[in-house]
């Protein structure tokens, strides 16, 4: 029996099948079993990382350091690769065994935590065919997927999907916003066989839909029928001139007239001053510019609409989705701050298996970390307030000593002198 | 929106120099790349070389390689373009042109087109 | 290095659809944006990534790339659509326009 066969076995799932003309194509089939981890990446044997990751060869890139950062939830589990030098490009990788996901889920989880409140910066991970030469991985290096958050000044503060489909890099025509907080937080993208894709954040979906409708992948289902154009004699004025009208006989005043109430100054010369004119006022009986009143077009026919056609150079395609082949992992960006940690990555068919792991791995920690970056917080503003009260403690001081400088030289004489002295004058 | 404002014609004499200055307001300097295009009379339109100035790298066309250099200065929101050794076949208007960044990576102005330009700047190179 | 290829001039009737076109080997791959230039002004954006309108480009402008033509349609062209058109896309970070196409529109 041919493998689908013993796929489908049970009662009758083939007649099922046919009763219901349930279209399905053998690449699009795929059961369930064992989750498939193609990779899987913690940072959790110390230097270890350091043979699995390839450094692009050149001097001036950003090094990563391995690092749980300045606060975290758990201090070796939240070691993760942390880009270490301002104004750097970085380029590092890591291989796995090449697989292909026709027919089956792609999941890519990764955490990302920019605890350095990061101005301009990626956050991103793009997923490369294993033909990648890891040692030369730059910003024209073709990839398969890129996916994760970008933060570059005020304008963009994005989760970039980005899939290359027949050599183009294609983006996603919706907006959607990554974290920009300090703190860890876990993306998550799932590529399914039916042509669907989700984001998730944090565990919980943020967007998803269908691949043809929110990348321009295919080119348009309809366009404009090139062979019509708009007929002489449509008529898109919905009003026009009252015909019938027409500009009264008194309706052309000058707009300014001279001021009747004005006298010529008694101490005017005119051979000094030349010939008297009055001011100009505004002419209140001034209509303006005569408009005909405006009635409906009898000839209107509304805005005339291009007919659209059926696109000759449409043609669906069912494997958008997939790719044959994916080998590496890399991080390639741009970063104007440095301080960003990147963790807990996973490639898998698997959707739960992802969630799980998220919740795992970042699920248990993220409390922790904030736990201690308030801590944190609160006693750098303790600190703060303890400095402020100092430098306002020692200003008072300074203030004291200048007046005393300031004030004239008085005899020095004891209290106790003092006193005697208003005693007795008293 | 950003506006991009050029500074003006120049002649200059072969075998000199010139600097043309592209001063932008109204938007993010750092949210934008800066290109140069120049366009001789009667020419079509020419790529010299480009900028990201929160980067601070420019990347230049094979042709103008070691001839020009194009810098930015972000505390002015100027971009700046020198070209060096001029001859009279390089009489023509010079465009400044902005494209969204729309992400930290410096191909990022790729996907976008150069949305903005100036207003142009005749250079007229002749002894 | 990377050519891109237009026809030097396109006419057209007023209200007809225009088509320029513009060849390069897999152009599909690219990113494909068309800029109107007018004489004695800078060049305007009006199609980005093969066929999106910047803000404010009329509708009648749109764009398609496959294959190894890109091409911009101007549908129910008007007189005031009389200008030069180009090509431009991204090869290797390096910037590449075609060398243009100055649309007629007759009559």
């Known amino acids: 029996s041919s493998s689908l066969e013993v796929l489908f076995q049970g009662p009758g799932l083939n007649d099922i099948f046919e009763a219901q003309k349930i279209e399905w194509h053998e690449e699009n089939l795929y059961f369930q079993g064992e989750p498939a981890v193609y990779f899987k990446e913690q940072f959790l044997d110390g230097d270890g990382w350091t043979s699995r990751w390839i450094e692009k060869h050149k001097s001036d890139f950003g090094k990563f350091v391995l690092s749980s950062g300045k606060f975290y939830g758990d201090e070796e589990k939240d070691k993760g690769l942390q880009t270490s030098q301002d104004a750097r490009f970085y380029a590092l990788s890591a291989s796995f065994e090449p697989f292909s996901n026709k027919g089956q889920t792609l999941v890519v989880q990764f955490t990302v935590k920019h605890e350095q409140n990061i101005d301009c910066g990626g956050g991103y991970v793009k997923l490369f065919p294993n033909s990648l030469d890891q040692t030369d991985m730059h910003g024209d290096s073709e990839y398969n997927i890129m996916f994760g958050p970008d933060i570059c000044g005020p304008g963009t503060k994005k989760v970039h999907v980005i899939f290359n489909y027949k050599g183009k890099n294609v983006l996603i025509n919706k907006d959607i916003r990554c974290k920009d907080d300090e703190f860890t937080h876990l993306y998550t993208l799932i590529v399914r066989p039916d042509n669907t894709y989700e984001v998730k954040i944090d565990n919980s979906q943020v967007e998803s839909g269908s691949l043809e409708d929110d990348w321009d992948f295919l080119p348009p289902k309809k366009i404009k029928d090139p062979d019509a154009s708009k007929p002489e004699d449509w008529d898109e004025r919905a009003k026009i001139d009252d015909p019938t009208d027409s500009k009264p006989e008194d309706w052309d005043k000058p707009e300014h007239i001279p001021d009747p109430d004005a006298k010529k100054p008694e101490d005017w010369d005119e051979e000094m001053d030349g010939e008297w004119e009055p001011p100009v006022i505004q002419n209140p009986e001034y209509k303006g510019e005569w408009k005909p009143r405006q009635i409906d077009n009898p000839d209107y026919k509304g805005t005339w609409i291009h007919p659209e056609i059926d696109n000759p150079e449409y043609s669906p395609d069912p494997s958008i989705y997939a790719y044959d082949n994916f080998g590496v992992l890399g991080l390639d960006l741009w970063q104007v701050k440095s301080g960003t940690i990147f963790d807990n990555f996973l490639i898998t068919n698997d959707e739960a298996y992802a969630e799980e792991f998220g919740n795992e791995t970042w699920g248990v920690t993220k409390a922790a970390e904030k736990q201690m970056k308030d801590k944190q917080d609160e006693e750098q503003r303790t600190r703060r307030m303890m400095r402020t009260k100092m430098r306002m403690r020692r200003m008072r001081r300074t203030r004291r000593k200048m007046r005393r400088k300031m004030s004239p030289a008085r005899p020095r004489t004891s209290c106790r002198e003092a006193c005697l002295q208003g005693w007795t004058e008293a | 929106e950003v506006q991009l404002v050029q500074s003006g014609a120049e002649v200059k004499k072969p075998g000199a120099s010139v600097k043309v200055s592209c001063k932008a307001s109204?938007?993010?300097?750092?949210?934008?790349?800066i290109s140069w295009v120049r366009q001789a009379p009667g020419q079509g339109l020419e790529w010299m070389g480009g900028?990201?100035?929160?980067?601070?790298?420019?990347n230049y066309a094979q042709k103008f390689q070691g001839r020009v250099t194009i810098t930015a200065d972000e505390s002015t929101s100027t971009a700046y373009m020198e070209l060096s050794s001029l001859r009279s076949e390089d009489t023509a208007v010079y465009y400044c042109?902005?494209?969204?960044?729309?992400?930290?990576?410096?191909?990022?102005?790729?996907?976008?087109?150069?949305?903005?330009w100036g207003q142009g700047t005749t250079v007229t190179v002749s002894s | 290095s990377y050519e891109l290829t237009q026809p030097p001039s396109v006419s057209v009737a007023p209200g007809k659809t225009a088509r320029v076109t513009c060849g390069g080997n897999?152009?599909?791959?690219?990113?494909v944006h068309w800029y109107q230039q007018k004489p004695g002004q800078s060049p305007v954006l009006v199609i980005y990534?093969?066929?999106k309108r910047p803000s404010g480009i009329p509708e009648r402008f749109s764009g398609s790339n496959s294959g190894n033509t890109a091409t911009l349609t101007i549908s129910g062209t008007q007189a005031m659509d009389e200008a030069d058109y180009y090509c431009?896309?991204?090869?290797?970070?390096?910037?590449?326009f075609g060398g243009g196409t100055k649309l007629t529109v007759l009559g």
């Open positions: 042109a902005s494209s969204p960044l729309r992400g930290s990576g410096w191909y990022w102005h790729y996907y976008y087109g150069m949305d903005v």
């Open positions: 109204g938007g993010t300097f750092s949210s934008y790349a």
């Open positions: 900028i990201i100035p929160i980067f601070g790298t420019a």
């Open positions: 897999n152009i599909r791959a690219k990113h």
């Open positions: 990534q093969d066929s």
């Open positions: 431009q896309a991204w090869d290797s970070s390096t910037v590449v």
